[in-house]
């Protein structure tokens, strides 16, 4: 039986917690403060690598507004919330006959039938091919007539009944009825080059973060698509090896737009799913852009039902400061969608982009009429407005030196939101309610349930928000919890992680230090993990795990198990992490202090946090390196190439060199064009590869993947290139049909093992 | 310290010119919409007009007792707000404030200028 | 366009007095009702902001309720540099519109 509620507040406390933060800190080590006496084990390499301490997450998948699907011992399981009891679902014997291992699975809204995937195979970050049956849950059978095609792209049900909507060789397919035929929606697609209702290589990476490009009003009468254009787009091609026995390599062929090249075009339609006939195809009715953006280059980057009858689209053009949000209305007698221009809401940034990494979406009241969206206030925060459809102004509903992370549900009485406001920590979470008849009336429904444990939360509300899973990760052991909306009151405790954290108590275990320091009179914050045992009056080696992308946070309240655990545990190297210019959730001051000139302050940040942990005193300052993946790769690799004397060592994976390589909506959303006339002359002075005369004063590991479809081997090669031509010895290492995440179980432990033995070379480790 | 200065005012015939310039201090000033808001003698407020910040465009609205004579306008570049009056009317005749608008919770007029005062008569 | 109707037009009052002013608009505003104090000679000050939330720095005497089409401003307590003319304004639809101002007099 779980814990009950309140007998759980006291359990898990400073005493067993592995990691606490408060501010400036406060370090925890259980046992005895002398490092000699204690002879428990350390959290070691291996223990990372096949991950030895497991977290226990709690994934659960509302069906209603007061159930939800979870999984145990591979029996799905419906927990409900009414009544507090959990039933059988499905059985694992189920699909015993089935044949396949099943990947996933997706119950249709009115719970008659179960979608099973299989033979899934992967793309890239988000999008994959698989094969789908659908199991009929009335007859206990699976459906054999009219199956989904293998190979298929994206599966969708419609949000209520059990409409399928599908993509298959880059075409839209929806079936009425699980046993039907489908009824064919798009001719156009073909591979690399017309997309329907999928997105191509950049749109999943940087606008939708998603593979489907498909959206079912909330009735499921009517789909609306995107349809993207690459025929223009050049394409990156690289080797994928393969088997040993394959005599000529394979040749990748991508779409991918790199800074100032062609980009996809798109266009967007909407079918009604009602009206689909076996006689004739199908109408899919368009609705194009804006005026104001057919003027030139732009993106579709966001679309919301509003209700049965009403889209809200959003548009960015090209140049990433200027977005236009069109509400458009289904005109019965026309069977076309009306988007008044008095409609419109324009959205600009005249101190860098648009919203953190794009337009942030609408959050519609039930009527459609008014919206909620979090923008940018008069100081730089970005904070909640409200907006009437009618009416070009919005009203900002909350206020404050801190941000509005998201907007999590919205009621006829209540919006509830993430913040980071409680105790001012940029890198805390907490779960608020404010109320809609009087938005004075803000309430904190996380903030003092666990303070010390849980600081970082996210939520999962049911269908209506009736109930919610609060999902605490940290500082101490993750938490999950299930709440009534009606009075907030905690009902059960889910998952507490005890069993980990009892196996945990058996290992010097690292702290956490969660702090600021003041430059230019901002605060600009930073953690650290220490060593077991950390003594101030001693000297550490430090490791700089660096990111500083726009909008990133390295410095937060979360808990994690990873290798800088492990490096502070068994090697006592402090692991630290400082959120400097360009980073996010604390104001546009800071985060488009980098705006136009990637490669500058987030660098000289870096450089000068490291210069700043040096004088506190326990840091050998003969002894920090400096490690980063991706963009924290190329800060690495622009730090290292400073020329500072800070470093000694570091290690770039999967670097980005110089910033016309890589793709043009993410580089140019901060960078501009590189061209003359608007900002070529930033883009060649940023590069790794100007600095390379500077890396003969630094050891310096390289490592990429060779088959990276986001960061191209073609950047570590030229940084290669570059060492090479300036005489620099240098370590690299690459991974063999690896992509950027370099995360085969193979390769992801030779990376970790690599870099660890080049960190102990460089810190004189034994 | 947010200031705002309004400077301009005098008297004029009725159907002449003339135009308001409001100093502003002490903020970013094309962060914020402005408003002119007047206050004829011994009575009541009255919102004139007002331009939005730099993210929306400057755009303008106005009441329609001023809609088609008056024009809002902004220099950036100066921080400064101007309220150009054509056709003046002997209704006009009023104490012209500046005002920063806040949206938060609403528009409200966070901080005033001490006034300027404009006499239409012949 | 809304009206706005604030009474009484003026009254009369003792420091250490209780005062309440009345605003009621011609329709739903919604609680975007705002209360400015204005002294002779001298520019309107933000109090009250959203029917209740008081400007930074006005004191914690002043208090605003109401709702719908009917808003109330009172001072719990009046002091000597209270005695001014104070005016409501909705700020839910443009045209943004006043009352036509309560002064509130020394007895």
């Known amino acids: 039986m779980k814990t009950p509620w309140k007998v759980l507040l006291g359990l898990l406390g400073a005493a067993a917690l592995v990691t606490i933060i408060t501010v400036p800190v406060v370090l925890l080590n259980k046992g005895t403060d002398d490092a000699t006496a204690d002879s428990r084990k350390t959290y070691t390499l291996t223990d990372y690598l096949k991950n030895t301490y497991r977290l226990k997450l709690y994934s659960l998948r509302w069906i209603s507004d007061h159930e939800y699907l979870y999984k145990q011992e591979n029996n799905i399981l419906v927990f409900n919330a009414e009544y507090g009891n959990s039933s059988v679902f499905l059985e694992n014997s189920t699909f015993d006959e089935f044949g396949h291992s099943i990947n996933d699975y997706s119950i249709s809204p009115d719970g008659q039938f179960i979608l099973l995937e299989y033979n899934y195979v992967k793309q890239w970050r988000h999008s994959y091919t698989a094969s789908y049956d659908i199991y009929d849950l009335n007859k206990r059978q699976l459906i054999t007539e009219e199956r989904i095609p293998n190979n298929t792209q994206w599966v969708t049900w419609s949000p209520v009944g059990h409409k399928l909507a599908y993509v298959w060789n880059n075409d839209i397919y929806v079936k009425i009825e699980p046993n039907l035929p489908s009824y064919r929606i798009t001719w156009t697609g073909k591979e690399d080059i017309i997309y329907n209702g999928i997105t191509d290589w950049v749109y999943e990476e940087e606008v939708f973060s998603a593979y489907s490009a498909l959206w079912w009003s909330p009735n499921g009468t009517f789909l609306a698509y995107a349809q993207f254009n690459d025929t223009e787009v050049p394409l990156i091609e690289y080797s994928f090896y393969s088997d040993e026995s394959l005599q000529y390599p394979k040749t990748v062929r991508v779409p991918y737009p790199k800074a100032g090249a062609v980009n996809p075009t798109v266009k967007f339609f909407v079918v009604n799913t009602d009206s689909l006939s076996s006689v004739t195809n199908a109408t899919s009715i368009q609705i194009t852009a804006p005026a104001s953006m057919l003027i030139g280059d732009h993106y579709l980057c966001d679309v919301t039902w509003a209700t049965q009858e009403r889209i809200s689209l959003q548009w960015l053009r090209r140049i990433q400061n200027y977005s236009v949000m069109d509400i458009c209305d289904y005109d019965e007698s026309s069977g076309r969608w009306n988007c008044l221009v008095a409609r419109q809401h324009i959205e600009m940034s005249t101190t860098g982009w648009v919203g953190r990494f794009r337009p942030s979406e609408p959050h519609f009241t039930l009527d459609g009429n008014s919206f909620y969206k979090i923008i940018s206030n008069e100081e730089g925060y970005r904070h909640i407005c409200y907006f009437q459809i009618d009416k070009k102004d919005c009203t900002f509903i909350t206020k404050g030196t801190w941000e509005v992370i998201g907007i999590e549900a919205l009621t006829s009485d209540y919006l509830y939101y993430i913040s980071n406001e409680y105790k001012g920590m940029p890198g805390g979470r907490n779960l608020y309610k404010i109320q809609l008849s009087d938005y004075t009336k803000v309430t904190c429904l996380s903030c003092e349930l666990n303070p010390e444990r849980c600081q970082y939360y996210s939520v999962s509300f049911s269908k209506e928000a009736k109930y919610y899973q609060l999902r605490c990760s940290g500082p101490g052991l993750p938490l999950y919890t299930l709440h009534s909306s009606v009075n907030d009151k905690g009902l059960r405790v889910l998952e507490d992680n005890s069993a980990l954290d009892k196996m945990l108590q058996n290992v010097q275990m690292p702290s956490k230090k969660l702090d600021f320091i003041i430059l230019n009179e901002t605060k600009f914050w930073y953690q650290m993990i220490l060593p077991p045992h950390f003594d101030k009056s001693k000297k550490y080696p430090l490791l700089l795990d660096v990111y500083a992308g726009p909008c990133s946070q390295k410095a937060d309240t979360v808990f994690r198990l990873n290798w800088a655990t492990y490096l502070a545990s068994t090697e006592n190297i402090i692991v630290a992490s400082f959120d400097g210019r360009g980073s996010g959730y604390q104001g546009d001051k800071i985060m488009h202090a980098i705006n136009r000139r990637l490669g500058t302050f987030e660098v000289e940040d870096q450089i000068e946090a490291a210069r700043q942990f040096s004088k506190m005193g326990f840091v050998d300052n003969k002894r920090i390196a400096i490690w980063g993946w991706s963009y924290g790769g190329y800060v690495t690799s622009m730090v290292l190439g400073s020329g500072s004397g800070v470093f000694k060592c570091g290690i770039a994976v999967a670097p980005v060199s110089r910033w016309e390589y890589y793709d043009s909506v993410y580089t140019e959303r901060y960078m501009g064009l590189p061209t003359p006339e608007d900002n070529l002359d930033h883009y060649r002075n940023s590069t790794v590869m100007s600095r390379a005369e500077n890396f003969k004063q630094v050891e310096y590991l390289l490592i990429h993947g060779t088959a990276d479809d986001n960061v191209h081997f073609q950047q570590s090669a030229q940084i290669s290139k570059a060492l090479v031509d300036v005489g620099v010895d240098f370590q690299a290492m690459w991974y063999t049909d690896e992509d950027h995440g370099i995360a085969s179980s193979t390769a992801h432990q030779h990376i970790y093992t690599h870099m660890s033995h080049f960190i102990k070379q460089c810190f004189s480790l034994p | 310290e947010v200031q705002l200065v309004e400077s301009g005012g005098g008297l004029v015939q009725p159907g002449g010119s003339l135009r308001l310039s409001c100093a502003a201090s002490g903020f970013t000033f094309t962060n914020y919409y402005m408003s002119w808001v007047r206050q004829a003698p011994g009575k009541g407020l009255e919102w004139v007009a007002f331009?939005?910040?730099?993210?929306?465009?400057?755009?303008?609205e106005y009441s329609a007792s001023v809609k088609g004579r008056f024009t809002i306008s902004r220099d950036n570049s100066k921080n400064t707000l101007y309220l150009q009056m054509n056709s003046l009317r002997a209704e006009d005749t009023a104490v012209y404030y500046c005002?920063?608008?806040?949206?938060?919770?609403?528009?409200?007029?966070?901080?005033w200028g001490q006034g300027t005062l404009v006499t239409v008569s012949s | 366009d809304i009206q706005m109707t604030q009474s009484p037009s003026s009254l009369s009052a003792s420091p250490g007095d209780r005062v309440t002013i009345s605003c009621r608009a011609s329709?739903?505003?919604?609680?975007?009702l705002t209360w400015y104090q204005q002294k002779p000679g001298q520019a309107p000050k933000l109090l009250i902001y959203?029917?209740?939330r008081l400007h930074s720095g006005v004191p914690s005497r002043f208090s605003g309720s109401g709702s719908g089409t009917d808003y109330t401003l009172t001072i719990s307590s009046l002091e000597p540099e209270d005695f001014a003319t104070y005016y409501c304004?909705?700020?839910?639809?443009?045209?943004?519109?006043f009352g036509q101002g309560t002064k509130v007099e020394i007895k």
């Open positions: 005002a920063r608008v806040l949206r938060y919770l609403g528009y409200n007029f966070d901080y």
């Open positions: 959203y029917r209740s």
């Open positions: 304004q909705q700020d839910n639809t443009l045209p943004w519109t």
């Open positions: 329709q739903d505003i919604g609680n975007f």
């Open positions: 331009i939005r910040d730099k993210a929306n465009g400057y755009t303008t």
